[in-house]
């Protein structure tokens, strides 16, 4: 990740807004504060981004390297099967879930995990870099 404004000014990757980080063609925002899943989704949408939808194992692995033990909301929900917010199924990883009332997805350095959607967690937004 090119951690432009979080750790250093990085002239080679100026294309993400302040406090966002660049990886490939995308910018990522890792929140410090905590919100429920819906509020996290709304935060991202208001910034022309979406709650993190992970495209493949490589991206997931890279993001997990950056994360701590703390869970962060991602754009994953259980609507008759685990699906990303764009409707695509979760197919490159499993989500740890054995409760039928935990229907929102979160990620930390170790795993994808189901949680009750009203729990306040940090979150990750993602958008295409300019």
């Amino acid at each position: 990740l090119c951690q432009g404004s979080k750790y250093s000014t990085c002239a080679s990757c100026p294309s993400c807004p302040d406090h966002w980080m660049k990886y490939g063609n995308h910018c990522y925002y890792f929140s410090v504060e905590k919100k429920d899943w819906i509020s996290s989704l709304e935060f991202c949408l208001a910034r022309d981004s979406h709650l993190l939808m992970i495209t493949d194992k490589q991206e997931m692995s890279l993001l997990q390297d950056f994360l701590s033990e703390a869970f962060h909301w991602v754009g994953l929900r259980n609507n008759s099967g685990w699906r990303w917010e764009d409707g695509s199924p979760l197919n490159f990883s499993r989500i740890y879930s054995n409760s039928l009332v935990q229907t929102c997805g979160a990620i930390n350095k170790n795993s994808l995990q189901a949680s009750s959607c009203e729990v306040s967690l940090q979150w990750v937004c993602k958008k295409v870099s300019p």
Epitope: D36, F71, Y96, N98, S99, V101, Q102, Q113, S115, E118
Partner: antibody
Framework: QVILKESGPGLVKPTQTLTLTCTFS??????????IGWIRQPPGKALEWLAH???????SYNSALKSRLTISKDTSKNQVVLTMTNMDPVDTATYYC?????????????????WGQGTTVTVSS | DILMTQSPLSLPVTPGEPASISCRSS???????????LEWYLQKPGQSPRLLIY???NRFSGVPDRFSGSGSGTDFTLKISRVEAEDVGVYYC?????????FGAGTKLELK
């Protein structure tokens, strides 16, 4: 699948301490959002929540019984233990453990999706 | 503590007929997060309770659609559209919105 099973002494004398064990499988009590609660039911009466414990070791107790209750977990054995001191005949009941789900408040919970079959405890001299 | 008052305490019903159980809380049980953690459990004779409805109106997995929950604030209702023999048992309402979590006294549904 998720299974919970309670075990206990069956018969306890007044003033003695009751120790109950809930042994579970099908999930881990180290997993974010998971908890186990204890609920009791005196013969022919309603259900009463006693205590619960969360994955992060946070605990909550029924305030009326708090001074008598201790809940703990042993994640390596997949067990939760409830102790209740100074037992009295009015504590005669079936004691259940149930898995609880976190929604943001450590002091309470929702959705007891899975219950044990219960263990009967009689308090009598 | 929040008192959960159920009525009736006993409910004889003819198979195929509807049934309705009321649960009233002594104070509003909407949580500060906007959700209402009101649940219904059925305890069949000789068995442990099992979850039927959570968050007022959400049917738990495997629960037949003849069961429905409704209500808000302090007044809640469990309805069975057509009672079947397997529905016999004691129905409990439960609130987890406020500390301590509390159960109602139960409603015993029996067949006429």
């Amino acid at each position: 699948q998720v299974i919970l099973k309670e075990s206990g002494p069956g018969l306890v004398k007044p003033t003695q301490t009751l120790t109950l064990t809930c042994t579970f499988s099908g999930f881990s009590l180290t997993t974010f959002g998971m908890g186990i609660g204890w609920i009791r039911q005196p013969p022919g009466k309603a259900l009463e929540w006693l205590a619960h414990i969360w994955w992060n070791d946070d605990k909550s107790y029924n305030s009326a019984l708090k001074s008598r209750l201790t809940i703990s977990k042993d994640t390596s054995k997949n067990q939760v233990v409830l102790t209740m001191t100074n037992m009295d005949p009015v504590d005669t009941a079936t004691y259940y453990c149930a898995r609880t789900i976190y929604y943001g408040n450590y002091l309470t919970f929702y959705a007891m999706e899975h219950w044990g079959q219960g263990t009967t405890v009689t308090v009598s001299s | 503590d929040i008192l959960m008052t159920q009525s009736p305490l006993s409910l004889p019903v003819t198979p195929g007929e509807p049934a309705s159980i009321s649960c009233r809380s002594s104070q509003n049980i909407v949580h500060s997060n906007g959700n209402t953690y009101l649940e219904w459990y059925l305890q069949k004779p000789g068995q442990s309770p099992r979850l039927l409805i959570y968050k007022v109106s959400n049917r738990f997995s495997g629960v037949p659609d003849r069961f429905s929950g409704s209500g808000s604030g302090t007044d809640f209702t469990l309805k069975i559209s057509r009672v079947e023999a397997e529905d016999v048992g004691v129905y409990y309402c439960f609130q987890g919105s406020h500390v301590p979590p509390t159960f109602g006294a139960g409603t015993k549904l029996e067949l006429k």
